[in-house]
């Protein structure tokens, strides 16, 4: 199709080489198609259009995304050629940064319902470059945590080194929806609730003599509880003795509850004690069996192919540890009578 009639938008993604980050393009179809395809609200010229949320969009029609090769080759279908780019209804999500993402991206309705829709498309010229090392050291992260119940703030990474006074007007989106009521480079949250969690996008305009660009950054915001003050507790095994049958296989499960820690490095090991000897056993990887806001339950099993007389003389020890401290639970095997 002819893309010369597409409306054009220029975006800049200045990514940090120090951290992982994502990027998002919205398909801003021109009126009147946008309400028809992406269910946007019709706002006055002084307002920014609402964007489709990433979730709850099962019943919405799709748009098709293409990338325009710089050498003039035909348009490429994003889904076929770029596995690190995810098409999600009216949004395009880049999972990894890199200058190779620089290029022109075109979106248009998948189903053309009228002749006018043929020209209904948006061309986004995306320039991707690493952030210069000269930029400030304390720039905000693309992953930010808000502590539940307390006051917090969400900073626009590309503007976090500027004071509120010198910052340009910022357009914010949360989960793809416009937050029209906040326009500074930092969103203050007086009391953090779970619903403040989500994907935030901040945009501001940067102009030079030749043209103007929208500088965009994406922030993943997580709502968290305070770090635990407790060492992990072992939920299973509860008993210190376990009845077993000689010659039969045996699996002993160790389950422990670890309180939330922002920097989470749980340790879970099985040891065997035999007289004066003690050694760590090679066992299958630990796995998380339940994860909540406040804690995580992790399980790790020790597997004996068959129980021997020697095993009855041994003590099997589950050892768990977090940054606060460690807990152990010993199990002695006893032959079933």
């Amino acid at each position: 199709f002819n893309i010369s009639g597409c409306s054009t938008k220029k975006l800049l993604w200045a990514y940090s080489t120090r951290s992982e980050e994502e990027f998002i393009l919205f398909c801003d179809l021109p009126e009147p198609q946008k309400s028809h395809f992406c269910h946007r609200s019709q706002l006055s010229p002084t307002q920014v259009p609402d964007h489709l949320p990433f979730t709850d969009s099962k019943d919405l029609p799709d748009v098709q995304w293409y990338r325009q090769p710089s050498n003039g080759d035909p348009l490429e279908d994003i889904r076929k050629s770029y596995p690190h780019i995810i098409q999600d209804k009216c949004t395009l999500r880049f999972l990894t940064p890199g200058v190779n993402n620089t290029g022109s991206y075109i979106c248009r309705p998948k189903m053309i319902k009228s002749p006018y829709d043929v020209a209904c498309c948006v061309k986004m010229i995306l320039e991707v470059k690493p952030q210069s090392n000269a930029s400030c050291e304390n720039s905000a992260s693309h992953k930010q945590d808000l502590l539940l119940g307390s006051t917090g703030s969400i900073s626009c990474p590309s503007l976090s080194c500027q004071s509120d006074a010198q910052s340009p007007e910022v357009t914010w989106y949360k989960n793809g929806k416009l937050l029209s009521m906040t326009r500074s480079n930092r969103i203050v949250v007086d009391e953090v609730y779970i619903y403040h969690q989500g994907t935030y996008v901040c945009d501001y305009t940067q102009s030079d003599t030749a043209s103007s660009w929208t500088v965009r950054a994406v922030v993943q915001v997580r709502t968290i509880v305070g770090d635990t003050k407790l060492k992990p507790d072992i939920l299973d095994p509860v008993e210190s003795t376990l009845e077993v049958e000689l010659g039969k296989p045996l699996t002993i499960s160790c389950k422990a509850r670890f309180g939330f820690e922002r920097v989470f490095n749980p340790v879970m090991k099985w040891y065997i004690k035999d007289a004066d000897l003690e050694w760590e056993v090679s066992v299958p990887e630990a796995k998380s069996i339940k994860s909540t806001l406040k804690d995580e339950i992790i399980e790790r099993n020790i597997i004996l192919e068959k129980v021997t007389q020697r095993d009855l003389r041994r003590t099997f020890v589950c050892f768990v540890q977090n940054s606060i401290g460690n807990t152990t639970q010993s199990v002695q095997l006893k032959e079933k009578r």
């Epitope: 949320p53 009521m181 906040t182 007086d190 009391e191 609730y193 619903y195």
Partner: antibody, heavy 123, light 107 residues
Framework: QVQLVQSGAEVKKPGASVKVSCKAS????????MHWVRQAPGQGLEWMGI????????TYAQKFQGRVTMTRDTSTSTVYMELSSLRSEDTAVYYC????????????????WGQGTTVTVSS | DIQMTQSPSSLSASVGDRVTITCRAS??????LNWYQQKPGKAPKLLIY???SLQSGVPSRFSGSGSGTDFTLTMSSLQPEDFATYYC?????????FGGGTKVEIK
């Protein structure tokens, strides 16, 4: 408890302006957006706009754009709604209503309402 | 703008009746729907938010359901104090819009 107290009834001539106040108490004023909704006699509810008391940012319904101004005074925890170039069809009860969730977020619902201010426009 | 259409515009019912009011949005609004009750001369009162969540202090005989474009408010056993006008409202995008209202009267 959370309360919104609005200013008293007003009678205005066509072409004039009216400024309605809404004083908030019982919660952190800057944490929650404030909506303005009106209701003409015997009619339904009509959303006029919303203000963020923290930054003073506003979003108005297209219908009122250019005629409505919403402001706030954080020192007195009060929001104001001024409607200019009044006409007879602006005769209505005007309500301020607190957004139910701490900003910023999706709009959730208006969980506390003022008692309403009757504005009569008549020549 | 998103249009909200409520039906019926009025209904007559008796105490103890099960009453259902429907609300339809002109486009998908996910679950961004709220229900309000208004009595004559009083300000509206929030009953249900996010289509199905009961606002604190609201009796459990009120319930909401639906997603996308079609929503319902149900009163399982009508009480004398429930005779009022009910409004649905979408909070999916600005301008926020209300339904025309449903007046519940005593039969």
């Amino acid at each position: 408890q959370v309360q919104l107290v609005q200013s008293g009834a007003e009678v205005k001539k066509p072409g004039a302006s009216v400024k309605v106040s809404c004083k908030a108490s019982g919660y952190t004023f800057t944490s929650y957006y404030m909506h303005w909704v009106r209701q003409a006699p015997g009619q339904g509810l009509e959303w006029m706009g919303i203000i963020n008391p923290r930054g003073g940012y506003t979003t108005y319904a297209q219908k009122f754009q250019g005629r409505v101004t919403m402001t706030r005074d954080t020192s007195t925890s009060t929001v104001y709604m001024e409607l200019s170039s009044l006409r007879s069809e602006d005769t209505a009860v005007y309500y301020c209503a607190k957004e139910g969730r701490v900003s910023p977020t999706d709009y959730y619902g208006m969980d506390v309402w003022g008692q309403g201010t009757t504005v009569t426009v008549s020549s | 703008d998103i249009q909200m259409t409520q039906s019926p515009s009025s209904l007559s019912a008796s105490v103890g009746d099960r009453v259902t009011i429907t609300c339809r949005a002109s486009q998908s609004i996910s679950s961004y729907l709220n229900w309000y009750q208004q009595k004559p001369g009083k300000a509206p009162k929030l009953l249900i938010y996010d289509a199905s969540s009961l606002q604190s202090g609201v009796p459990s005989r009120f319930s909401g359901s639906g997603s996308g474009t079609d929503f319902t408010l149900t009163m399982s056993s009508l009480q004398p104090e429930d005779f009022a006008t009910y409004y649905c409202q979408q909070s999916y995008s600005t301008p926020l819009t209300f339904g025309g209202g449903t007046k519940v009267e005593i039969k």
